[in-house]
Interface confidence: medium
């Protein structure tokens, strides 16, 4: 069985304040079943940025329809970027359970925020 890969193709993304940022993430397999979550930062202090199952994330939208059968694209778009959004974002695959178990993280995409050109 091929090992699951969580692929974040861009090591870094730079966006002007006020614009939208797209953070790309794909998985190499639909197996095992379980959700994808996005975090800013790593380790115990990481911050939950997007969770399809529950949460209130009005500035964050899924690029593809995550509920669509056989979807392997879990990229997100964050609108109206501010300097406070800068950081490294990780796409993380979980195995479905009670609670869900973290399986694999992408390598991370560093988001830097430029001042809006005047």
């Amino acid at each position: 069985e091929e090992e699951l890969q969580v692929i974040q193709p861009e090591k870094s993304v730079s966006v002007a304040a006020g614009d939208s940022a797209t953070l790309n993430c794909t998985v190499s397999s639909l197996i095992p079943v379980g959700p994808i979550q996005w975090f800013r930062g790593a380790g115990p202090g990481r911050e939950l940025i997007y969770n399809l199952k529950e949460g209130h994330f009005p500035r964050v939208t899924a690029v593809s329809d995550p509920t669509k059968r056989n979807n392997m694209d879990f990229s997100i778009r964050i609108s109206n970027i501010t300097p406070a959004d800068a950081g490294t974002y990780y796409c993380v695959k979980f195995r479905k359970g009670s609670p869900d178990v973290e399986l694999k993280s992408g390598a991370g995409t560093e988001l830097s925020v430029r001042a809006k050109p005047s």
Epitope: A17, G18, F39, R40, G41, P44, G45, R46, E47, L48, I49, N51, E54, G55, H56, F57, P58, R59, T82, P83, A84, D85, A115, K116
Partner: antibody, heavy 119, light 108 residues
Framework: DVQLVESGGGVVRPGESLRLSCAAS????????MNWVRQAPGEGLEWVSR????????DYADSVKGRFTISRDNSKNTLYLQMNSLRAEDTAVYYC????????????WGLGAPVTVSS | ETVLTQSPATLSVSPGERATLSCRAS??????LAWHQQKPGQAPRLLIY???NRATGIPDRFSGSGSGTDFTLTISSLQTEDSAVYYC??????????FGGGTKVEIK
């Protein structure tokens, strides 16, 4: 209706500890970042700490870093602030505040819990 | 760190008149600014978010404007129940979240 009710305030001596609680109702507590904001007598508002919806990400004001710990129990719809090594300058009314988004404004506030640190 | 300066510190206005409150940021905060109202002995209440959007249930006599570094809260026709301290809050840079020092609105 959104309701945030703080408890656990009181009078303590310098160096002592206190734990504040904030009971939340009327919204999906586990879906929102939460904050503590304080107001010293006759003064303005000072942000103290923030915790993300999942409980993993936390931030603190420099004035309380290393002494205060924010936490939450999503199964009990409750936010906490553990305050250790209390100082006279920590005397304030402590409000819990719900955040609209993970990086956003505070859309609902609790009624506040008074904390007095005095010898 | 972004500093928010509110002026005037105190504003005395007659009922029915217009009240204009100012909040100036030490660096741009885009449109990421909110206004909160705090009546004596009460908790703060959100009035305006994203510089100009009224929060749920806020009367339309309250309006916000501005972007970048200069913001204004206007109460078009002051009512006696508007006597309060008004705070601006930025959420463009954080932590920390910053509040202005407040403007006290008194009824003449």
């Amino acid at each position: 209706d959104v309701q945030l009710v703080e408890s656990g305030g009181g009078v303590v001596r310098p160096g002592e500890s206190l734990r504040l609680s904030c009971a939340a109702s009327g919204f999906s507590f586990r879906s929102y970042a939460m904050n503590w904001v304080r107001q010293a007598p006759g003064e303005g508002l000072e942000w103290v700490s923030r915790i993300d919806s999942g409980g993993g990400g936390t931030d603190y004001a420099d004035s309380v870093k290393g002494r205060f710990t924010i936490s939450r129990d999503n199964s009990k719809n409750t936010l906490y602030l553990q305050m250790n090594s209390l100082r006279a300058e920590d005397t304030a009314v402590y409000y819990c505040a719900k955040q609209y988004d993970w990086n956003s404004f505070f859309d609902y506030w609790g009624l506040g819990a008074p904390v007095t640190v005095s010898s | 760190e972004t500093v928010l300066t509110q002026s005037p510190a105190t504003l005395s206005v007659s009922p029915g008149e217009r009240a204009t409150l100012s909040c100036r940021a030490s660096q741009t905060v885009g449109s990421k600014l909110a206004w909160h109202q705090q009546k004596p002995g009460q908790a703060p209440r959100l009035l305006i978010y994203d510089a100009s959007n009224r929060a749920t249930g806020i009367p339309d006599r309250f309006s916000g404007s501005g972007s970048g570094t200069d913001f204004t809260l206007t109460i078009s026709s002051l009512q006696t129940e508007d006597s309060a301290v008004y705070y601006c809050q930025q959420y463009y840079y954080w932590p920390p979240y910053r509040f202005g020092g407040g403007t006290k609105v008194e009824i003449k």
